[in-house]
């Protein structure tokens, strides 16, 4: 039960973790005009991942989008990589943790299979969410450096008889969005992969019993089944099956040998 | 058609307070910010501030704030400025004007003249 | 605030006359997010409310004849009237729409000669 329920609170927990790294991949406040310290302009600049954009007074806002790749910094297209990097593979996260639900049953499945798509959309989970994170933080980055750039230029770039606002740009809402949303997608991972160790021991504790019941010799020790709900002793647990560290994958063959007799 | 009927001349005397209005057809009225714009007789043209309708923000020159308040009617798509402790200095014409992409004033009132006399 | 200069303060023209009037502001009014200025140049005759020309600094506003011409950037802006008519006579002021306040520059008069 406790599996199940950590296993589902990691995928809603990635879900909503997917969806707020794909908003943030599309919003437009990424970075927006710093107006502290500075002549209120009658006019707010902000800027996206693939567009920038400016609000007026009036309120009338005109957004305009890259239109060139090449003339992009090469920061903002690493960025953007990243961010698409943690989207498609969250994505393909989502759709193999949904397969991977205990809760579902497809066909004839075995547990033991659900445990590695549990632990596979896991590590997606993780990785979807260091992406965005690494992505944010750089975004991040370049703005602090520039913030402080320009604000050096302000104090310094005063000897002409003209004065220039200067635009100061400082984080916006994407940003703390995206570093949330990671954050969601890389806990609903570790939950997933938490989730896939307590699915496995279940799985071979079901055929131990399957084989005893079908009257072959089990070279198991029965003992090992007392422990088969506990998350603690996993790896313990499946040392006192046959003293030897099996993959998942070797695991998953057992069946074909014996419980279809 | 855009309009922007404004209300009629004020004779008032000094330290008596004038409340003007600003009545827009013609479009909807919430979504345009409204500008009110001074001009003394013979001279130029001086920024007051502006209300939003949509939410009742304002922006004031700091030359009026105190002096001048902006306030909107939804219901009867209607801005109005109230200029308190008249004097001399604040006869004027005053207009109210639709602010526009680029931050422009497409569309003005006929105006409001204000004469401040004892 | 923002001072606008406009020169000249008068102007004495010919119809058909090819008419620059100019007008500096202290402060560059080039916003860098959309590198558009956000200067206005407005119109105003006797008696009358003063009458959008041009935003954006060379933007003209529909239904103003295409002999108005705005120009400029950063600081220095120009109202250009390739051929004066004699509905031109009027005032002409700029304006900074850009930092608060918004402030109009003094005005150039034009006169029929």
């Known amino acids: 039960m406790a599996v199940t329920a950590c296993q589902g609170l990691g995928f809603v927990v990635s879900l909503i973790g997917i969806a707020g790294i794909i908003a943030a991949t599309c919003m437009d406040q990424w970075s927006t005009q710093d107006l502290y310290n500075n002549p209120v302009t009658a006019v707010f600049n902000y800027q996206g991942l693939w567009r920038s954009c400016v609000r007026e007074s009036s309120g009338f806002t005109e957004c305009r989008g890259y239109f060139t790749l090449l003339g992009l910094p090469a920061m903002l297209q690493a960025v953007r990589a990243l961010m698409i990097v943690g989207i498609v593979l969250g994505a393909i996260g989502l759709l193999v943790s949904i397969f991977a639900l205990k809760c579902i049953r497809i066909g004839s499945m075995e547990d033991s299979a659900k445990a590695n798509m549990t632990l596979t959309s896991g590590i997606m989970f993780i990785v979807s969410g260091l992406c965005a994170i690494a992505g944010v933080s750089v975004f991040a980055n370049m703005l602090v450096t520039n913030f402080w750039m320009s604000t050096a230029n302000m104090y310094t770039g005063m000897g002409g008889m003209v004065q220039t606002v200067q635009t100061r740009y400082t984080f916006g809402a994407a940003l703390f969005v995206g570093w949330v949303a990671g954050g969601l997608t890389l806990i609903g991972g570790v939950m997933m992969c938490i989730a896939c160790r307590g699915l496995a021991p279940e799985e071979t504790n079901y055929k131990a019993v399957s084989y005893h019941a079908s009257g072959h010799s089990v070279a198991y020790k029965p003992g090992g089944f007392k422990a088969s709900t506990g998350f603690g002793s996993n790896t313990k647990n499946k040392k006192t099956y046959d003293g030897g560290a099996h993959t998942e994958d070797e695991l998953q063959s057992y069946p074909s040998k014996h419980d279809y007799v | 058609e855009v309009q922007l009927q404004q209300s009629g001349p004020e004779l008032v005397k000094p330290g008596a307070s004038v409340k003007m209005s600003c009545k827009a057809s013609g479009y909807t009225f919430t979504n345009y910010v409204m500008n009110w714009v001074k001009q003394k007789p013979g001279q130029g043209l001086e920024w007051i501030g502006y209300?939003?309708?949509?939410?009742?923000?304002?922006k004031y020159n700091e030359r009026f704030k105190g002096k001048a308040t902006l306030t909107s009617d939804k219901s009867s798509s209607t801005a109005f400025m109230e200029v308190s402790s008249l004097t001399s200095e604040d006869s004027a014409v005053y207009y109210c004007a639709r602010l526009y992409r680029g931050n422009a004033m497409d569309y003005w009132g006929q105006g409001t003249s204000v004469t401040v006399s004892s | 605030d923002i001072v606008m200069t406009q020169s000249p303060s008068s102007l004495t023209v010919t119809v058909r006359e090819k008419v620059t009037l100019s007008c500096k502001s202290s402060q560059s009014l080039l916003n860098s997010g959309n590198q558009k200025n956000y200067l206005t140049w407005y119109q105003q005759k006797p008696g009358q409310p003063p009458k959008l020309l041009i935003y954006w600094a060379s933007t003209r506003e529909s239904g103003v004849p295409d002999r108005f011409t705005g120009s400029g950037s950063g600081t220095d802006f120009t109202l250009t009237i390739s051929s004066v008519q004699a509905e031109d006579l009027a005032v002409y002021y700029c304006?900074?729409?850009?930092?608060?306040?918004?402030?109009f520059g003094a005005g150039t008069k034009l006169e029929l000669k």
């Open positions: 209300i939003n309708p949509y939410n009742d923000g304002t």
């Open positions: 304006q900074n729409v850009y930092i608060y306040p918004f402030t």
